[in-house]
Each structure stands twice: as C-alpha cells, then as structure tokens.
C-alpha cells in the first residue's frame, strides 16, 4: 500500500509568491512558492494519486506583513482552503502568546493541530483542552495513519508561550502516544514536528513504532540528485536513520518559506512496515501556475496590507544580505545596518564627557529573517523590513558587566557551524574568534567603542566595567540561550519597535549602503 506524504515547514507567512531567496517577489516570472502555486501542485498530486496526506511541520506564523496585520487568521484561512490534513505546532505559533494561537488558529482550523510534548496546566488547561491534540488517526482510503506531533522543547526560550504550558522532552513524550496508537491497531505512524533535524533523527532512532519523521525548525534542505535551486542539500531525501530496533526510518524536511513542497512516497507492507521510500522536494517555481481562485482570494486579503506597507521609506544601493547562510556564520551587512540604526535611535544624552550614552549593539543573527534585493529600484518599504524583522519585538537598552558580554560572545560561537541563531551581529564592537579553540574559550579579542571620549575609538573590554548595550528584547529575555544576559543584567529599559527603529533610520538616511567592514573576524 502506497502513501504519498506532501509536506511543508517553516513557511513563515509566505502566503504570496516570493523571489528565489524568499524575500518579496520582484519579477513575477522568476518568483516561487506562495499558497496559490502550492494549491495547484497539491491538487495535481491529489488527482493523480490515491492516498495523499498534506502535512505542515510548524512555523506558519511570523515572517511577513501578512502575519503583522492578520496575526494568524490568514494561516487558518488559507490552510483550510488548501485542505491540510494536519499541522504540528512550531515555536513561532506562540509569538503572540497563547491567546494569539488559540483565537486565530486553533479555533478556526478545520484540520487537527498536534503536539504530544506540550502539556497545559493551571487555568489554561481547560481553556485549551481539545484545541490541540497529541495525535490524530487519519483515514486514508480504507487504511488509517496515525500522526503524532511534537514541538521544540526550547520554545519557552524562543517565543512567548507563557507560564502555563510545559514543553517536555520530545522522545519521552512521544513514546507513550505511539504505544497508545499501536494498541489501537494503528500500524502506520508518522511523527510530525518542529524541533530541528538533529532531534528528528533522534526521534527516528529512539521512538519505537515511528515509521516516518516529517520535521521542521532547522530549515533543512534534503535532496537526492542535482538540486534545482540555490539550496545545498544537507543529505539525501529521504534521509534514512537506522532505528535502535533495526528498522530504516525515513526522515524528511522541506527547507522553508513555501519554496518547496516535500513529496515522499512510502510503500507499506501488510504489517505496516516501510518497505520502500523515495521522493524529493518539488521546487514551486513559475513553471507551476498559481491557482486562479486562491490567487483571487490572496488579492482580496492583500488590499488591507497595501496601505500599511507599500510606502517607500528610503533606498538602498547595495544588496542587504540578511540570509541565514551569512548572518548565522559571519558579519553580514544587514546586521550592520540594523545595529547602526539601533545606535542611531539612541543618540541622546551627549555632554562634554560622553559623545553618547551608548555605543554598543548586539543582535542575534537568527533574528534577521530575510535579505532585501537592491534590484527593485532600491526601494525599501515597511513590508520589506517586516520580512527582515518579523517578530514585532523591541530594541531595548540594558546595562551589563564586561564579563557578561564576554560570556555572550562565547555563547555566540559555542556550537558554530550549525546555522544556529545565536551568532551575534554587532555595532560598536570588534570581536575576533579562534574557532580552533574549544567552546567557551574562542573569543581572543573583544574591543568596544568608547563612549566617554570626544573621538570614538576601540578599547579592550574590561571585565568589571559596566556597559550600556542596545539589543533585541528577545536577547534581554534570555532568548537563543543567552541566559547570562537575562540573569546578569543590571538594568533593562524597554525600547522602540524594531521595524520602526530601522525604518526611521532609513528614512533619515534616505540612501543607504552598509558594508561588511571587519567588525567580526
């Protein structure tokens, strides 16, 4: 018996088609993704093949002006229109708090929303009961398939789930749910979730009875053969893991931003064992037409966004590199621009002794979510910035000891090379890393721009001195593992909305051309 699994993950509000790098679509003939195009492909496969499931592995929320304006209502509406069969909760589904998940999505979705490792407590338990499930048994033809969900246990550090949701270890939480499905005579089980590729592989290895793992969170691109676009595969599709009980378990993920539709064909034997698996992500490029009816609906919803977002704020004459491939690995000019804007926004309280009260900025590379292409007439709009900074955060002022900053920079590269979000972009700081040294001892030089000076210059960081730093509220609250900031900050003043800070700076500068200039080495 053959099952076709179609899957998406980390779509991040890309309801409309995008450019190849998942930023705003400029040249429609070269654009990709979007729900109208996705629907065309899904319907084509549903018509051609008998047993099809359409699954989403989380993080539909957050990423463009669509989410800024519609706050999740757009996710429910268009996922319903595409007739998704199930979705797992991602960390970003909690960005607007639990209420921002319950009202627009959980109450409106016509498909099951799953997570086995999130447990509600206190007053929330009764309010959220039944709105998301640990698993769901779906009829497919005359067979049944069990879907168990999971969500990154790091979600409390990555988003705003509040204090009444407990995020358990994925493997510990999944096993009893899979066992329950087995007792219900469900012998074909898919784990669908949002914890990243490494955890996906562990689930495949450790959770007895899971036949297939469909993941997200790490934006992992897997492909067998010659890849069709710019993404470099992290492995073959599907990625095969040998479980502890000797089975081969296919693990898949479909990059991000709705650019690809994951396509996995699984053949099961009479006992529910996977006897073969093959497929590849399908690049949703312009060779696939956008479905006219979904496109018309998009255009109708789009009207509300236009007023909000389309005025030109200023121009760039250079490519603003906000790609994760750059900003999570090295100095990127988008990071430099944002940090410069953050410092500029705090130009105040100068006197004879201090040219400014603050000169330093740090910004987690993972918070930069999109590049901006200068080839659109150089125009920068609010909408462009909302794709770069989609989280609706604030840029805050904190006071920290030098020793805390040193710890933060060590944390920045403690697991360098895994495309994790904690790699810091900077302003008013020069940092030199030696990655050949062991984690926790990689910062070999850390110089900071003086404030108590008439001519700003870089001096070595002093461990016992207290410094002011501008940073995202996400970091001030210990996000991306920066617990030392949360635990050791001496003062925290909340600041202005992140997009507004950058848009104000661009409007002020009129034309920008940020460079990569050796802040990070």
């Amino acid at each position: 018996w053959e099952l076709t699994i179609l899957h998406t993950n980390d779509v991040h509000s890309r309801l409309e088609q995008t450019s190849e790098d998942s930023s705003k679509c400029v040249n429609a003939s070269r654009c990709m993704g979007g729900v109208a195009r996705l629907f065309t492909k899904v319907q084509q496969i549903r018509r051609a093949e008998p047993n099809v499931l359409l699954l989403d592995a989380g993080d539909q929320y957050q990423g463009t002006i669509w989410f800024t304006v519609y706050k999740g209502a757009e996710v429910a509406h268009f996922m319903n229109a595409l007739r998704y069969d199930a979705m797992a909760l991602g960390n970003h589904e909690f960005d607007n708090g639990v209420e921002g998940l319950i009202e627009p999505l959980l109450k409106e979705a016509k498909f099951p929303i799953l997570s086995a490792n999130i447990k509600a407590k206190g007053p929330l338990a009764s309010q959220i009961s039944g709105l998301y499930l640990p698993y769901k048994v779906l009829p497919v033809g005359d067979e049944v398939v069990g879907i168990v969900g999971y969500t990154s246990k790091e979600t409390p550090f990555l988003s705003n789930p509040g204090t009444n949701l407990v995020f358990e270890d994925e493997i510990t939480a999944l096993q009893p749910e899979v066992d329950k499905l087995k007792t219900l005579n469900v012998n074909k089980i898919i784990a669908l979730g949002h914890s990243g590729f490494e955890t996906d592989k562990l689930i495949a290895q450790k959770v007895r009875g899971v036949d297939v793992v469909v993941g997200g969170h790490s934006n992992t691109f897997l492909y067998t053969g010659n890849p069709p676009s710019k993404e470099v595969p992290a492995g073959k599709y599907p990625f095969i893991v040998t479980s502890d009980d000797g089975r081969k378990v296919p693990v898949v993920q479909a990059y991000a931003f709705g650019k690809y539709l994951g396509y996995l064909k699984i053949e099961f034997d009479e006992r529910g064992n996977v006897i073969s698996s093959h497929g590849n992500p399908i690049l949703l490029n312009s060779s696939i037409p956008e479905d006219p009816s979904i496109k018309a609906d998009i255009n109708k919803w789009r009207i509300k966004l236009d007023n909000y977002s389309t005025q030109e704020l200023g121009k760039t004459i250079v490519y603003l590199d906000g790609s994760s491939q750059s900003c999570r690995f090295r100095e990127c000019n988008m990071g430099n621009l944002i940090c410069d804007a953050m410092i500029n926004n705090n130009l105040r309280h100068a006197d004879e002794m201090f040219w400014n009260h603050v000169s330093m900025c740090i910004l987690n590379g993972g918070g930069i979510r999109s590049p901006i292409d200068e080839r659109n007439n150089g125009t920068i709009t609010w909408e462009n910035l909302a794709a770069v900074l989609p989280f609706g955060g604030t840029f805050d002022l904190v006071q920290l000891k030098g020793s805390t900053l040193k710890k933060a920079f060590e944390h920045s590269v403690h697991r360098y090379g895994q495309s994790t979000g904690e790699f810091l972009q900077v302003g008013g700081i020069h940092v030199v890393y030696d990655l050949s040294r062991k984690p926790g001892d990689r910062v070999v030089k850390l110089d900071v721009l003086c404030t108590k000076c008439r001519v700003p210059s870089y001096d070595p960081l002093k461990m016992d001195e207290i410094y002011k730093v501008i940073l995202p509220n996400f970091l001030a609250n210990g996000g991306d593992g920066f617990q030392m900031i949360k635990d050791e900050l001496l003062r925290h003043d909340s600041g202005d909305q992140d997009i507004n800070v950058v848009s104000t700076y661009i409007s002020k500068m009129k034309v920008i051309y940020p460079a990569v200039e050796g802040r990070i080495k």
């Epitope: 018996w1 081969k248 034997d269 009479e270 006992r271 064992n273 996977v274 006897i275 073969s276």
Partner: antibody, heavy 112, light 107 residues
C-alpha cells in the same frame, strides 16, 4: 496479526485441474498484492504471478500464463490459484505470499 | 527478468561462528530486497526487508547490508536453530525473482 492460511494437500490425476485457496486476515485484503510461488525439491523457488484483490488485476510469469489462473474473493478475503492440465511436473509445494508473510504451503501431488 | 545469484549454495559452520550469505542482482533493485528463512517444515519467515530493516521478533544477530549490487545477510553468532535454508528475494519489479538458496549446515 497478518496471516495467510492455505488449503490442505491435494492428490490429483494427470490432466485434471485443482484450485488452491489462501485466506488472508489481519490486514486490509484489497490493498496488497498476493503472489504465488512454486517450490519443487532441489529446484528453488519460482514466481507464478500476482493478483491485486482491490481491482482483480493479475500478472503472470511467462512460464505459467497458460497453467495458472489467479482470482480473489474480496467478501471472504480469499485468493485462489487454479492450475489446469496437470502433469507430474506440477507436483510441488505452492505458496501464497505477501511482502511480509507467507502461507504455510499447499502440497500438490499429481499421480495416476 | 532480474537475476539473483546467491552464494554459497551450502555452507558448513559451527555454533557461535559469524557467517555471511550474498546475493548479486543483475540489474538495479535499489533497496528492495528481502531475506527469507525456510524452516525444515517448509514454512517461510521474513528476516530482513528493504535490504537492512530487521523484522520485529527477529533476533539482532541477523543483519542485512548492501554494497553496490551485492546484498548480504550476516548472522553474527550462529545458534542451533539457524541451521536451515535462506533465500533472497527482489521485489523491485515483477516477476519477483529469488536467489537459488543457501543451505546452512552445522559443522
């Protein structure tokens, strides 16, 4: 659990026909192929053909296309193989098989 | 049709010994290979499916692997009940084809 239960041994005369049954349980009969395999002592295993019970579609090995007829009754989840114009060469053990499990085998003896 | 060449046709080994049986496919079959055990009573039991996945209830001393077009069944430490017949079967395309079998005998 998955089981394929075959009919008992057959002793038939040359030239006659025989119909062997294979009753499936523990899974959805119409969704999986049933294959038939012949084993003669010292001659290994030979694939005869398959039937897909959901549609009734069949495929035969060239060698057996005039010898075997495969059918299925979905109401009883039973597959059948009829062998015709029997000769001593047809004396063998016949197995029905899915991808996961095999029937216990039916011994056919063709003798006058 | 795809030919499956199984070797050796018979093998004499001792209790506790490690043995490997091999099947070579004449055409690409990917990972669509099964190893079957036939007991003296004639009943067949699947040990390995999809080249290297171990069937539930099958002892972990059995393992399957692939190198190019060569497929192997390895028994890491022979036990008395392992001295029976073994067949490989490709299910990549019809007709199914089998290896000629290996008779494993106790030394």
């Amino acid at each position: 659990q998955v089981q394929l239960q075959q009919s008992g041994p057959e002793l038939v005369k040359p030239g006659a026909s025989v119909k062997i049954s294979c009753k499936a349980s523990g899974y959805i009969f119409t969704n999986y192929y049933i294959h038939w395999v012949k084993q003669r002592p010292g001659q290994g295993l030979e694939w005869i053909g398959w039937i897909f019970p959901g549609s009734g579609n069949t495929k035969y090995s060239e060698k057996f296309k005039d010898k075997a007829t495969l059918t299925a009754d979905t109401s009883s989840s039973t597959a059948y193989m009829q062998l015709s114009s029997l000769t001593s060469e047809d004396s063998a053990v016949y197995f029905c098989a899915g991808l996961s499990d095999w029937g216990q085998g039916t011994t056919l003896t063709v003798s006058s | 049709d795809i030919q499956m060449t199984q070797s050796p046709s018979s093998l004499s080994a001792s209790l506790g010994e490690r043995v490997s049986l091999t099947c070579r496919a004449s055409q690409d079959i990917g990972d669509r290979l099964i190893w079957l055990q036939q007991e003296p009573a004639g009943t067949f039991k699947r040990l390995i499916y999809a080249t290297s996945s171990l069937d539930s209830g099958v002892p972990k001393r059995f393992s399957g692997s692939r190198s190019g077009s060569d497929y192997s069944l390895t028994i890491s430490s022979l036990e008395s009940e392992d001295f029976v017949d073994y067949y490989c079967l490709q299910y990549a395309s019809s007709p199914w084809t089998f290896g000629g079998g290996t008779k494993l005998e106790i030394k």
